[in-house]
């Protein structure tokens, strides 16, 4: 049975607590007052009590009346000790005390679990004066109790610089089951067993659990909370919830979706973020993960040139950050690119293929077979070379850059010449006689200047010398070719 104290005009009937008489203390009052049959008596301080004297339930007034009789100790009367009530019901309880009229300005405050109750609470104090004493009844009401109203309530009265404290009123709120653990959404492997947990508490206990799958009860007999449901395996998505029942009624948990893990959908929106001569930066939007986190992705690259051998380059990368720089590509080439990602179940299909091109690059090799000879009659140096292989030009040849350095008696001077792409020879004027001329040539595309060829040196004698043989790019192993005439 549940005692529910309801609001009513008359004060709450005196209730000796769950154990009749047990809330009456063992001490007896020093002096009885009229209307004080329910008095709580004086608290006699123990000389062995540690710390400061305990300001307890009782104030012992020092004031004496006209007849010089000492005034009695003050204490709250006993009231209900324990109230159990249902959530959302109303409750009213009170403290009462009789105070000699000699005292003025007495105030009663309500406290719950050590904290003063201020503001939005219904606390009413009524005064019933008599010839010698005033009966004070402090009522506290809650119109719709919540679980948070659970607690130990006491009254405090300040009087004569003393604090009088009542015995506690324990308020225990019972209600529908309250979930402490609800089932959680899960992603599971097809046909693999898994567990769901549901736990709810009262009061009142016990709490019984029924499991529900797709709106149908799973267990015919209730299980005591906490309950673990073992599902042997699913082949398709399902929604589970649990019902918690106690004497007050039923609470239903949130419904949770149990998904079946599958291979991911292919990535979408593969796009080119940046292209260089030898790399392409791509990004993609991952497809649906199939209820299982992506582990990694694979970028597939094939040459779009119909004459290519159709081989596919594969680059593996982490699933994040949906960005990858494909390297080691040829310049000025067309590629088809697709992306596929995997989770624990397997690989997705490949995304729609996109076409991408690398840009022109600077040539990767220098012109070949560079030869240099002196044409004294015209006072020129003739230079000849072979253009680099087309594959290694990395773009459309726009010309050549010739570096010629003249060194004589500690003086060194470098000059640069630009030559159009059509020729494979050039003529430069002799700058200094009795000097060494060192020649290097680089191929040029719109992508930049390629590497310079190995240096070829030719000695330019003073005027009047004859017979000039050519100097040429050295065979491997000859580090510093010089034509001596």
């Amino acid at each position: 049975a549940i005692t529910e104290a309801r609001e009513e005009a008359k004060p709450y009937p005196l209730f000796p607590g769950p154990f009749p008489g047990s809330l009456q203390t063992d001490h007896t009052p020093l002096l009885s007052l009229p209307h004080a049959s329910g008095y709580q008596p004086a608290l006699m301080f123990s000389p062995t009590q540690p710390g400061r004297p305990h300001t307890g339930n009782v104030a012992i007034p020092q004031v004496t009346s006209v007849e010089s009789k000492p005034l009695p100790p003050l204490a709250f009367k006993h009231t209900v000790g324990h109230i159990i009530l249902s959530e959302h019901k109303g409750v009213k309880f009170n403290c009462s005390i009789s105070v000699p009229n000699i005292y003025q300005d007495t105030t009663i405050s309500w406290w719950k679990d050590g904290k003063e109750l201020l503001g939005a609470h219904h606390a009413i104090t009524q005064f019933y004066p008599d010839d010698e004493v005033t009966a004070i009844i402090a009522s506290f009401s809650i119109t719709s109790v919540q679980r948070s109203d659970n607690g130990s309530y006491i009254c405090k009265m300040k009087i004569n610089n003393e604090e009088i404290v009542s015995d506690p009123i324990y308020i225990e709120v019972q209600g529908l089951p309250h979930f402490t653990k609800q089932p959680e959404s899960m992603n599971v492997t097809r046909n693999t067993a898994f567990n769901l947990t549901c736990q709810a508490v009262g009061p009142p206990e016990p709490v019984n659990i029924f499991w529900v799958q797709n709106s149908s009860r799973v267990n015919e007999q209730p299980e005591k909370s906490p309950s673990v449901l073992t599902v042997p395996g699913l082949t398709e998505m399902a929604v589970f919830s649990c019902e918690a029942h106690n004497d007050k009624g039923l609470t239903v948990s949130k419904g949770v979706q149990i998904n079946i893990k599958a291979i991911p959908s292919p990535p979408t929106e593969v796009s080119i973020r940046n292209s260089t001569a030898h790399s392409i930066l791509i990004s993609w939007v991952p497809g649906f993960d199939g209820y299982s986190p992506f582990r990694n992705c694979s970028i597939q690259v094939k040459e779009a040139d119909p004459l290519s051998n159709g081989s596919v380059m594969i680059f593996n990368t982490s699933a994040l950050p949906h960005l990858y720089q494909i390297k080691q590509l040829q310049a000025l080439a067309n590629y088809s690119i697709g992306v596929s990602c995997m989770n624990e179940i397997g690989w997705s299909a490949v995304s729609p293929w996109i076409l991408a091109s690398t840009t022109e690059g600077a040539p990767s090799v220098a012109p070949l077979n560079v030869t240099v000879f002196l044409n004294e009659s015209s006072d020129n140096v003739d230079i000849r070379w072979m253009k680099p292989p087309t594959k290694q030009q990395d773009g459309e040849l726009v010309g050549y850059r010739i570096s010629h350095v003249w060194q004589s008696a500690g003086i060194s001077k470098e000059l640069l010449e630009e030559v159009g792409q059509n020729g494979s020879r050039a003529r430069i004027s002799v700058q200094v006689h009795n000097a060494t001329c060192t020649v290097r040539i680089a191929a040029v595309t719109r992508g930049g200047v390629g590497p310079f060829s190995d240096p070829v040196k030719i000695f330019i004698p003073a005027h009047g010398w004859v017979d000039y043989a050519p100097s040429s790019t050295p065979a491997p192993g000859n580090a510093d070719p010089v034509l001596i005439i």
Epitope: A1, I2, T3, F15, P16, P18, F19, P20, G21, S22, T25, D26, H27, Q40, L43, F45, H54, G56, N57, V58, V80, G81, H82, I83, I84, W111, K112, D113, G114, K115, N150, G151, S152, I154, I164, V165, S166, D167, P168, Y170, I171, E172, P203, E205, P206
Partner: antibody, heavy 118, light 112 residues
Framework: QVQLQQSGPELVKPGASVKISCKAS????????IHWVKQRPGQGLEWIGW????????KYNENFRGKATLTADTSSSTAYMQLSSLTSEDSAVYYC???????????WGQGTSVTVSS | DAVMTQTPLSLPVSLGDQASISCRSS???????????LHWYLQKPGQSPQLLIY???NRFSGVLDRFSGSGSGTDFTLQISRVEAEDLGVYFC?????????FGSGTKLEIK
């Protein structure tokens, strides 16, 4: 979380007194009754009495009146029980326990062993 | 005083068995507020008592559903549906309806 920490074991002489402590934490000490219980070796449990620390009110089992004195110090959230005129019959483990909202002794101290021996 | 008579004094069981302990009061434990303040405790060797069931049939927080209580007035029962090794110890009933509070004499649950 609610905890009650009791003082260590005591070895006392017959006729002497002993005071054991019970320090509370994890809840409002002045809002809940503290009860004391005696357990002699290999025997059952006997209720000694309660104190309400909020106002110092006490209630004793008649069998322990004059034997046990219950006090509380709110500044340190500690309840005390003094046992006087000790005899071998008082050799026991003494427990403090909180009377919770459900009106049951829901949390207990670890116990204090008192041995009375000359 | 309300005298609490607990039976049996000793209860040998096999693990997995059901166990039942009885507690009988010399007077009704129903309080004037309609509640019955009869509680069950387990004391494991070398430990303090721990609350299992409060007010006849309510499991205290953290107590497993193997434990259940029933009864009214003067007769009360604690049942353990499937005894496990960790359940061994002494079980006490306690009434707090009447002062002085009184305990049952205890039932020692032990392995057969």
């Amino acid at each position: 979380q609610v905890q009650l920490q009791q003082s260590g074991p005591e070895l006392v002489k017959p006729g002497a007194s002993v005071k054991i402590s019970c320090k509370a934490s994890g809840y409002s000490f002045t809002s809940y009754y503290i009860h004391w219980v005696k357990q002699r070796p290999g025997q059952g449990l006997e209720w000694i009495g309660w104190i309400f620390p909020g106002n110092g009110n006490t209630k004793y089992n008649e069998n322990f009146r004059g034997k046990a004195t219950l006090t509380a110090d709110t500044s340190s959230s500690t309840a005390y029980m003094q046992l006087s005129s000790l005899t071998s019959e008082d050799s026991a483990v003494y427990y403090c326990a909180r009377l919770g909202l459900i009106y049951a002794l829901d949390y207990w101290g670890q116990g204090t062993s008192v041995t009375v021996s000359s | 005083d309300a005298v609490m008579t607990q039976t049996p004094l000793s209860l040998p069981v096999s693990l997995g068995d059901q166990a039942s302990i009885s507690c009988r009061s010399s007077q009704s434990l129903e309080s004037s507020n309609g509640n019955t303040y009869l509680h069950w405790y387990l004391q494991k060797p070398g430990q303090s008592p721990q609350l299992l069931i409060y007010r006849v049939s309510n499991r205290f927080s953290g107590v497993l559903d193997r434990f259940s209580g029933s009864g009214s007035g003067t007769d009360f029962t604690l049942q353990i549906s499937r005894v496990e090794a960790e359940d061994l110890g002494v079980y006490f009933c306690l009434q707090v309806t009447h002062v002085p509070f009184t305990f049952g004499s205890g039932t020692k649950l032990e392995i057969k």
